[in-house]
């Protein structure tokens, strides 16, 4: 009897081990299938969206990541309140699960656009480094379904990189002109969004609680029109200490206004950054390692 019990325990342990191995193999197969399906992404022919089939709808890239899809690329998501799904680039590096809401990389897209374009989104939604704005409507749908962290990756023309991260990133609805709300800052680029780099400048420099403005819809705190002067849509105050939708210049620039891709606390107003990625992920994101 004792021998029988021991044999049962040994067999159970073996079954558990086999189950674990099968699970690992399933994950590996899923990843290999996925990589096989989108291997051309790394070969430069990036003109597609990764089709996950109709298995389920994902609210954001963190859900896709936690479902085993570890390859960065374009996926379709449908936030809870969103009436339709839409394409977005998922950054599965840097801990994974990041939904990219904006990218600047080469100046190929025009960011001097009106309210409707910024509301619905525009740009290149097929190429890995394509420039785009996901759309204020979509930002609202995304950021109201749970609490998100915004991470902004910045790079200059001298091969330096910095980042800024904000807890509780939220974009209001159309009624509130897609107002920006951000929480606690951390990072290496300095706090240009909340204007905390000097306590007495927030009146004109903070983007916190600012409404979105475009050349045709002026909601800033300036008697002029910041969006028109700076040729972009943004959460302008009087006018900005950060403007990541600005005109694409190659580093230092001179212009009538400081209308470049600006992050004041890193390079000041008169240096336009080489690349920007704005990406979001739930505050409480924990990668599903199984």
């Amino acid at each position: 009897l004792e021998d029988c019990a021991q044999e049962q325990m040994r067999l159970r342990a073996q079954v558990r081990l086999l189950e674990t191995r099968v699970k690992q193999q399933q994950v590996k197969i899923k990843q290999l299938l996925q990589e096989n399906e989108v291997q051309f992404l790394d070969k430069g022919d990036e003109n597609t969206v990764i089709d996950l089939g109709s298995k389920r709808q994902y609210a954001d890239c963190s859900e896709i990541f936690n479902d085993g899809y570890k390859l960065s690329g374009f996926y379709k998501i449908k936030p809870l309140q969103s009436p339709a799904e839409f394409s977005v680039y998922c950054d599965m590096s840097d801990g994974g699960g990041w939904t990219v809401i904006q990218r600047r990389s080469d100046g190929s897209e025009n960011f001097n656009r009106g309210w409707k374009d910024y509301e619905n989104g525009f740009g290149n939604f097929v190429q890995k480094h394509g420039e785009y704005w996901l759309g204020n409507k979509n930002l609202h749908f995304l950021t109201t379904q749970e609490d998100y962290t915004l991470k902004i990756d910045l790079a200059d023309f001298e091969k330096n990189s910095r980042y800024a991260q904000y807890k509780n990133f939220k974009v209001g609805d159309e009624k509130n002109f897609y107002e920006l709300n951000i929480g606690e800052y951390s990072g290496t680029a300095g706090d240009s969004l909340a204007g905390n780099f000097h306590p007495e400048v927030q009146w004109w420099a903070s983007h916190q609680r600012m409404k979105f403005s475009t050349w045709d819809r002026d909601h800033d705190n300036y008697e002029g029109n910041c969006a028109e002067e700076d040729q972009s849509g943004w959460w302008f105050n009087r006018c900005h200490s950060a403007n990541l939708n600005g005109v694409y210049y190659s580093g230092p620039y001179t212009a009538k206004t400081d209308n470049g891709i600006v992050w004041y606390t890193w390079h000041g107003w008169w240096y336009s950054l080489k690349s920007v990625v704005m990406k979001i992920r739930p505050n409480d994101f924990i990668p599903n390692v199984i």
Partner: antibody
């Protein structure tokens, strides 16, 4: 023509109160933040207070905080400065000025109101 | 608070002279610096805004330069109507501050 016209000069006793006014014309008043600046006799300029275009934000110099209140009536195109608990050191010419431009300069200025705090 | 130190506090000059007034900020204020002219019994008048931009209607003999902490107002050829007191002002911080003033007198 863009103009700021201030109320007349006045003598007030220490501890007393006074309200200054500044009437704006020639521009869209509710597009602009507004300031009060003062100048004691024979001295330099000292910023006193700011109010945002909608009245939602106000700022004060430490020397007047808790005693002075800036306000505006956009329907009347008028800026106000309510001055309470006045002291001898508040004696000055008070100017209203419009906050202009992205770099927040003061232009134009009112003609000034002399406030004398004396018993 | 951001302190502004003007120098000199007064100067004597003749008509036609080139006059330079400097203003130093206690910390970097980017280009948030403005210059004003004030004549006795009158309100100040804006000359230069955002460190180097000439206000409309101001004669071109006035010019401004500088960024960060060090700024200069230059009058290329002093005219009789330029004898006045000149103030620099920072508008970077919402605790706006002025320099102590520079009085330009006739030599």
């Amino acid at each position: 023509e863009v103009q700021l016209v201030q109320s007349g000069g006045v003598v007030v006793q220490p501890g007393g109160s006074l309200r200054l006014s500044c009437a704006a014309s020639g521009f869209t008043f509710d597009d602009y933040a507004m300031h009060w600046v003062r100048q004691a006799p024979g001295k330099g300029l000292e910023w006193v207070s700011l109010i945002s275009w909608d009245g939602g934000s106000t700022y004060y110099a430490d020397s007047v905080k808790g005693r002075f209140t800036i306000s505006r009536d956009n329907s009347k195109n008028t800026l106000y400065l309510q001055m309470n608990s006045l002291r001898a050191e508040d004696t000055a010419v008070y100017y209203c000025a419009r906050n202009s431009g992205r770099r927040n300069w003061f232009d134009p200025w009112g003609q000034g109101t002399l406030v004398t705090v004396s018993s | 608070d951001i302190q502004l130190t003007q120098s000199p506090s007064s100067l004597s000059a003749s008509v036609g002279d080139r006059v330079t007034i400097t203003c130093r900020a206690s910390q970097s204020i980017s280009s948030y610096l403005n210059w004003y002219q004030q004549k006795p019994g009158k309100a100040p008048k804006l000359l230069i805004y955002a460190a180097s931009s000439l206000q409309s209607g101001v004669p071109s003999r006035f010019s401004g330069s500088g960024s960060g902490t060090d700024f200069t107002l230059t009058i290329s050829s002093l005219q009789p109507e330029d004898f006045a007191t000149y103030y620099c002002q920072q508008s970077y911080s919402t605790l706006w501050t002025f320099g102590q003033g520079t009085k330009v007198e006739i030599k």
